[in-house]
């Protein structure tokens, strides 16, 4: 769900969840076009991650899931079922691939109309 | 179209052990986000979920039976295997396959029939 | 493990009818129940899942409602091809558990 999402983000760092509320083509609600920058493409792969949740059933923003935040690193269970394990993964992996990134204020608040038709194809 | 078939022997005497067989076809164990399951079914009682095993291999016992089961897959033949050693007559029951999804059950199978017997 | 009490364990109703049954989890399953009908001699058949949604080639007089811990099951005008036993199963939480079923007959 979206408070685990927030909290995995916050959990890692080094920004706050509030920075990629609408940042590039794909942080924030939908996406399309190309990924402006590392940023964004981190928030591409974590839009693939929850398609491929939702083609198996999953309701990426219903299910909730446990996890545990230790000296900045995210342990996600004890799941209950699938759904949990692998929506934890997709927020783990975005909040792991975050950490590591330039924060360009250039692609916040940027205009979607920038932003391709096209998107690449999740792998 | 998804089809699933059991296959088993039938009938054991007490400390014998199970092996079961599901056939399938339709879809692949290799495609992300579905699984094998079996439930059990004694005559005229509920339906008892005995384990899963997912595509990525992640199998899954329901917990008063774990040390007694175990799930396997052959995703290369379509099938997927349950073993439960050391049978008794509280295991006689009708023995369903299913596909499933995280959240629920998409296909059954049309069951096979288990009598443990002296 | 998750309990699911389903009621009635029988119900008669006439053709054209519309029926109902209920199903209720021990403990929150969100909307994570699924309807099954089973005919004499027959496969299982998926009719719902996530509470609500009607599984492909499922007719539109099968629905289903609720969240939480309650949950309703209703057909609309009931057909001859209807009669069967009908059961839920919370996905919540592994292992999957199942209602003790609904065996409908005919009036």
């Known amino acids: 769900g979206l408070l685990e999402l927030a909290g995995t983000l916050d959990c890692v760092g080094p920004r706050s969840p509030m920075a990629y509320m609408n940042y590039g083509c794909y942080c924030g609600l939908g996406g399309h076009g190309e990924p402006r920058d590392a940023i964004d493409w981190c928030c591409y792969h974590h839009d693939c991650c929850y398609s491929r949740a939702q083609d198996a059933g999953c309701s990426p923003k219903l299910d909730r899931y446990p996890w545990k935040c230790m000296d900045h690193h995210i342990l996600c269970g004890p799941a209950e079922n699938k759904c949990q394990e692998l929506l934890c993964r997709c927020d783990e992996e975005l909040a792991y691939c975050l950490a590591g990134t330039e924060y360009h204020l250039k692609y916040l608040f940027f205009p979607s109309i920038l932003c391709e038709k096209d998107s690449p194809k999740c792998n | 179209q998804v089809t699933l078939k059991e296959s088993g022997p039938g009938i054991l005497h007490p400390s014998q052990t199970l092996s079961l067989t599901c056939s399938f076809s339709?879809?692949?164990?290799?495609?992300?986000?579905?699984?094998v399951g079996w439930v059990r079914q004694p005559s005229g009682k509920g339906q008892e979920w005995l384990a899963h095993i997912w595509w990525d291999d992640d199998r899954y016992y329901n917990p008063p039976l774990k040390s007694r089961l175990t799930i396997s897959k052959d995703p290369s033949k379509n099938q997927v295997f349950l073993t439960i050693p050391n049978v008794n007559t509280a295991n006689t029951a009708t023995y369903y396959c299913?596909?499933?999804?995280?959240?629920?059950?998409?296909?059954w199978g049309q069951g096979t029939t288990l009598t443990v017997s002296s | 493990d998750i309990q699911m009490n389903q009621s009635p364990s029988s119900l008669s109703a006439s053709l054209g009818d519309t029926i109902t049954i209920s199903c209720h989890a021990s403990q929150n399953i969100n909307v994570w129940l699924s309807w099954y009908q089973q005919k004499p001699g027959n496969i299982p058949k998926l009719l719902i899942y996530k509470a609500s949604n009607l599984h492909t080639g499922v007719p539109s007089r099968f629905s289903g409602s609720g969240s939480g811990t309650g949950f309703t099951f209703t057909i609309s005008s009931l057909q001859p091809e209807d009669i069967a036993t009908y059961f839920c199963?919370?996905?919540?939480?592994?292992?999957?558990?199942f209602g003790g079923g609904t065996k409908l007959e005919l009036k």
């Open positions: 299913t596909q499933i999804l995280p959240h629920w059950v998409a296909y």
């Open positions: 339709g879809f692949s164990l290799n495609t992300f986000g579905l699984g």
């Open positions: 199963q919370q996905g919540q939480s592994y292992p999957f558990t």
